[in-house]
Interface confidence: low
């Protein structure tokens, strides 16, 4: 289709090479068409279409995204050619940063309901640049935490080094919806609830003598409880002896509960003690079996192909640790009689 009639928007993504971050493009189709797409004949020349991202209508979730190759080749369907770009309703998610994401992205409705819809499309020219050392060194993270029940704030990473007075007007979106009252480089939250969690996007306009463009940053916000003050506790095994049959296979499970920590590096491992020797055992990877806001239960098994006499002389020890401390639980195998 002819993209010459598409409305055009220029965006800049400046990414930090030190952290993982995502980026999004919204299919900014004009406001009056959010249910019927772009029947441009409904607008008089004096009416300026208000560009907004995804409006939540069922229709608008059905859009098609393309990338325009720089060499003039035909448009490419995003879903077929770019595995690191995911389409969610009318939003395009870039999972990994990199200058190779630079280019022109076009969105338009999948369903063309009238001849006027043919020209209904938005072309976004995205420029992606790594943050230079000259940029602010202590810019806000693209992953920010809000402590439940307390006050907090969400900062726009690309503007966090500027004072509120210097800051340009910022447009904020949460999960693709416009937050019309927020205009500064920081959203202040008086009391944090779990619904404050989500994907926030902050946009502001930058201009030079030639053109203007939108600088965009994406912030993943999670609501968290305070870090635990407790070391992990072992839920299983409870008993320190276990009756077993010689020659039979055996699996011993270690389940431990870890309290929430913002920087979470749980350790759960098995080791064997035998007389004056002690060594860690290669066992299957640990797996999380339950995760809540406050804690996580992690399980790791030790598997014996068959129980031998030698195993009865040993202690099998489950060791768990977080930043507060560690806990152990040892199990001695005992031959089942009769």
């Amino acid at each position: 289709f002819n993209i010459s009639g598409c409305s055009t928007k220029k965006l800049l993504w400046t990414y930090s090479t030190r952290s993982e971050e995502e980026f999004v493009l919204f299919c900014d189709l004009p406001e009056p068409q959010k249910s019927h797409f772009c029947h441009r004949n409904r607008l008089s020349p004096k009416q300026v279409p208000e560009h907004l991202p995804f409006m939540g209508s069922n229709d608008l979730s059905d859009v098609q995204w393309y990338q325009q190759p720089s060499n003039g080749d035909p448009l490419e369907d995003i879903r077929k050619s770019y595995p690191h770009i995911i389409q969610d309703k009318c939003t395009l998610h870039f999972l990994t940063p990199g200058v190779n994401n630079s280019g022109s992205y076009i969105c338009r409705p999948k369903m063309i309901k009238s001849p006027y819809d043919v020209a209904c499309c938005v072309k976004m020219i995205l420029e992606v640049k790594p943050q230079t050392n000259a940029s602010c060194e202590y810019s806000a993270s693209h992953k920010q935490d809000l402590l439940l029940g307390s006050t907090g704030s969400i900062s726009c990473p690309s503007l966090s080094c500027q004072s509120d007075a210097q800051s340009p007007a910022v447009t904020w979106y949460k999960n693709g919806k416009l937050l019309s009252v927020e205009r500064s480089n920081r959203i202040v939250v008086d009391e944090v609830y779990d619904y404050h969690q989500g994907t926030y996007v902050c946009d502001y306009t930058q201009s030079d003598t030639v053109s203007s463009w939108t600088v965009r940053a994406v912030v993943q916000v999670r609501t968290i409880v305070g870090d635990t003050k407790l070391k992990p506790d072992i839920l299983d095994p409870v008993e320190d002896t276990l009756e077993v049959e010689l020659g039979k296979p055996l699996t011993i499970s270690c389940k431990a509960r870890f309290g929430f920590e913002r920087v979470f590096n749980p350790v759960i491992k098995w080791y064997i003690k035998d007389s004056d020797l002690e060594w860690e055992v290669s066992v299957p990877e640990a797996k999380s079996i339950k995760s809540t806001l406050k804690d996580e239960i992690i399980e790791r098994n030790i598997i014996l192909e068959k129980v031998t006499q030698r195993d009865l002389r040993r202690k099998f020890v489950c060791f768990v640790q977080n930043s507060i401390g560690n806990t152990t639980q040892s199990v001695q195998l005992k031959e089942k009689r009769g």
């Epitope: 007389s275 004056d276 020797l277 002690e278 055992v281 030698r310």
Partner: antibody, heavy 119, light 114 residues
Framework: SLEESGGDLVKPGASLTLTCTAS?????????VCWVRQAPGKGLEWIAC???????TDYARWAKGRFTISKTSSTTVTLQMTGLTAADTATYFC??????????????WGPGTLVTVSS | DIVMTQTPASVEAAVGGTVTIKCQAS??????LAWYQQKPGQPPKLLIY???TLASGVPSRFKGSGSGTEFTLTISDLECADAATYYC????????????????FGGGTEVVVK
């Protein structure tokens, strides 16, 4: 004493079973029986051990899957070898360790049997 | 698996002299270490087990020491009959679950007696 048998000249890819036979004692729960090999002009290389009491086995990582140690009677232990290559050419020794002491330190060794893998 | 590193590869000493051979384990093996002597055309002979215990019939000129990862075999008052290759062996009786490496040998040290 211990004596190994079954060494032979075989082609690459072949299988071979070596036997270790005890004389003057039997392989009871008191002993570990181990196989060790030595390529011509090279050092000793541990292959595997078996607890003669409960039959539990222990292999060098490189030997797992291709070599199988078994106790076949109260006086014999075998080493089955599959997928032989020229790198398996060596003298194969069987040795006896002390299970009560719970180590593989071997106080009794056989004279060895030569396995040659060549096309 | 445990890796045993033995040094030196070769050592020369005079009759009546002393030779020291070192063996290093890639992880702690407590005192589960044996030393063997091997002469050409013969199977190895056990000298020392549990790092420092002399095997039956072995003269006290052979002395083993160390624990954990560092071990030493010292042969004093060298005799011509001591010319041989010496091997250390990690020999904890492990099982399939332990991944402890069983009976790995060091690369050997040739002792030449002048």
């Amino acid at each position: 004493s211990l004596e190994e048998s079954g060494g032979d000249l075989v082609k690459p890819g072949a299988s071979l079973t070596l036997t270790c036979t005890a004389s003057g004692f039997s392989f009871s729960s008191r002993y570990y029986v181990c196989w060790v090999r030595q390529a011509p002009g090279k050092g000793l290389e541990w292959i595997a051990c078996i607890d003669a009491g409960d039959g539990s086995t222990d292999y060098a990582r490189w030997a797992k899957g291709r070599f199988t140690i078994s106790k076949t009677s109260s006086t014999t232990v075998t080493l089955q070898m599959t997928g032989l290559t020229a790198a398996d050419t060596a003298t194969y020794f069987c040795a006896r360790g002390d299970a009560y002491r719970d180590d593989y330190a071997s106080d009794l060794w056989g004279p060895g049997t030569l396995v040659t893998v060549s096309s | 698996d445990i890796v045993m590193t033995q040094t030196p590869a070769s050592v020369e000493a005079a009759v009546g002299g002393t030779v020291t051979i070192k063996c290093q384990a890639s992880q702690s093996i407590s005192s589960y270490l044996a030393w063997y002597q091997q002469k050409p055309g013969q199977p190895p002979k056990l000298l020392i087990y549990r790092a420092s215990t002399l095997a039956s019939g072995v003269p006290s000129r052979f002395k083993g020491s160390g624990s954990g990862t560092e071990f030493t075999l010292t042969i004093s008052d060298l005799e011509c009959a001591d010319a041989a290759t010496y091997y250390c062996q990690s020999n904890y009786g492990s099982s399939s679950i332990s991944n402890y490496g069983g009976g790995a040998f060091g690369g050997g040290t040739e002792v030449v007696v002048k």
